[in-house]
Amino acid sequence: EDELQVIQPEKSVSVAAGESATLRCAMTSLIPVGPIMWFRGAGAGRELIYNQKEGHFPRVTTVSELTKRNNLDFSISISNITPADAGTYYCVKFRKGSPDDVEFKSGAGTELSVRAKPSAPVVSGPAVRATPEHTVSFTCESHGFSPRDITLKWFKNGNELSDFQTNVDPAGDSVSYSIHSTARVVLTRGDVHSQVICEIAHITLQGDPLRGTANLSEAIRVPPTLEVTQQPMRAENQANVTCQVSNFYPRGLQLTWLENGNVSRTETASTLIENKDGTYNWMSWLLVNTCAHRDDVVLTCQVEHDGQQAVSKSYALEISAHQKEHGSDITHEAALAPTAPL
């Protein structure tokens, strides 16, 4: 036992950011005369937190009235704690020296850890859309949390994912930490309505995890399927040909009809039919005046979807021999036969 002991009863104290931290310190004696000081850290680079003798410390209040006779309690309270306040705090007794005060005895130190909530996780998807069966990456980021221990999970439509990689930075001690995770997701045709969720659990969240979401609709492109068919005749000298554009996403679509390679009409899809899976259908039709054609006609439905390279489907509209001989007077219907796409 020493003539004066500095007792810091708590080895560690944990405080939520924004709260006040009480750091306890007691002396076993008031002799020798001299001030007490609180420091964060040890050694030459230690930071003065409170000096009983002099100075202005607006965030620090003493728990007891230090000027009260026989007071041995030198505990302090630090207000509005932030992660930057984390560290080991030492209560140090100085004795009057000649000429300067001399460090006399230090407490064992109290480690202050600050519990800081992670920021709301931000989930971001790929910069460009990908088609089904391809793998896309989603990233999840959250910052400013402490302590370092944290749990991150990924879900797709409620099902936990396993293909992801997570890093918490920095690796060493820090006042606060950041988490970065990348998940790999294989797209399917039905993913327009799908959602990925990044879920973060931390001690500060009291069992109520934070979630960040991203819609796969922002990441997926479902290319259309095309089908060209001839509808029943409206008149003997007309053929009604339709192009059914099915199961595409997103909605941006431009369709061009070509007759024998020459542009007949271009239109932008407007009134679309939405399917249950979130994809769209659209139908375009073309009336062909068979009287104007002496030879067979190749009709092409060409679709440019979401800025991608155009896809097309072609059909040969056969002009009958009878119609070829008699021109516009011939009323036999033309026969439509599919051909291979261009």
Epitope: E1, D2, E3, S29, G34, R69, N70, N71
Partner: antibody, heavy 114, light 111 residues
Framework: EVQLEESGPGLVAPSQSLSITCTVS????????VNWVRQPPGKGLEWLGI???????DYNSALKSRLSISKDNSKSQVFLKMNSLQSDDTARYYC????????WGQGTSVTVSS | DIVLTQSPASLAVSLGQGATISCRAS??????????MHWYQQKPGQPPKPLIY???NLESGVPARFSGSGSRTDFTLTIDPVEADDAATYYC?????????FGGGTKLEIK
Amino acid sequence: EVQLEESGPGLVAPSQSLSITCTVSGFSLTGYGVNWVRQPPGKGLEWLGIIWGDGSTDYNSALKSRLSISKDNSKSQVFLKMNSLQSDDTARYYCARAGKMDYWGQGTSVTVSS
Amino acid sequence: DIVLTQSPASLAVSLGQGATISCRASESVDSYGNSFMHWYQQKPGQPPKPLIYLASNLESGVPARFSGSGSRTDFTLTIDPVEADDAATYYCQQNNEYPWTFGGGTKLEIK
């Protein structure tokens, strides 16, 4: 039980130096300071200096140039050395524990005389 | 140096009566809310014995008949009631500033 015991030469010739040893028990010199106090015959007490637990010292400025206090923690001994003694240094020399001076030795009598 | 002046230099008190000894400092001995003034009792042929520390705190084993009071520059040791065993010389001492100093002493006689 806390005890302090002084041992000295008893008689010192003028202008010579004085060495006194204070041997302590019941406490550690690393944790407690030790004071030296003297008392001339029939007079009051005079504080000479202190050696603290960490080995640092503080002296009475009036005697500082003649005074040296040291210690050997392992032997639980504190040493007082005073140079250039004169007749007015004749006194009983005490060692006392800590800033509080809560325990005292019985003292050792020093006479400066030729 | 802080000079401590004790008064009276000596006093005689009847058994069972109260005794008051004064100690005046040439400057304040208060720091950080406490008075670094202490009192000792010395009997002939013996070392000083601590009685009171920090102006008013009784040392362990010291009878409650002894009490101390005061602050800054004016301090008092009171013995009430006085017993025959209290015959001794009483010293005040400050350790607020170097060099630490003692008062000249007050000799108490019991009548």
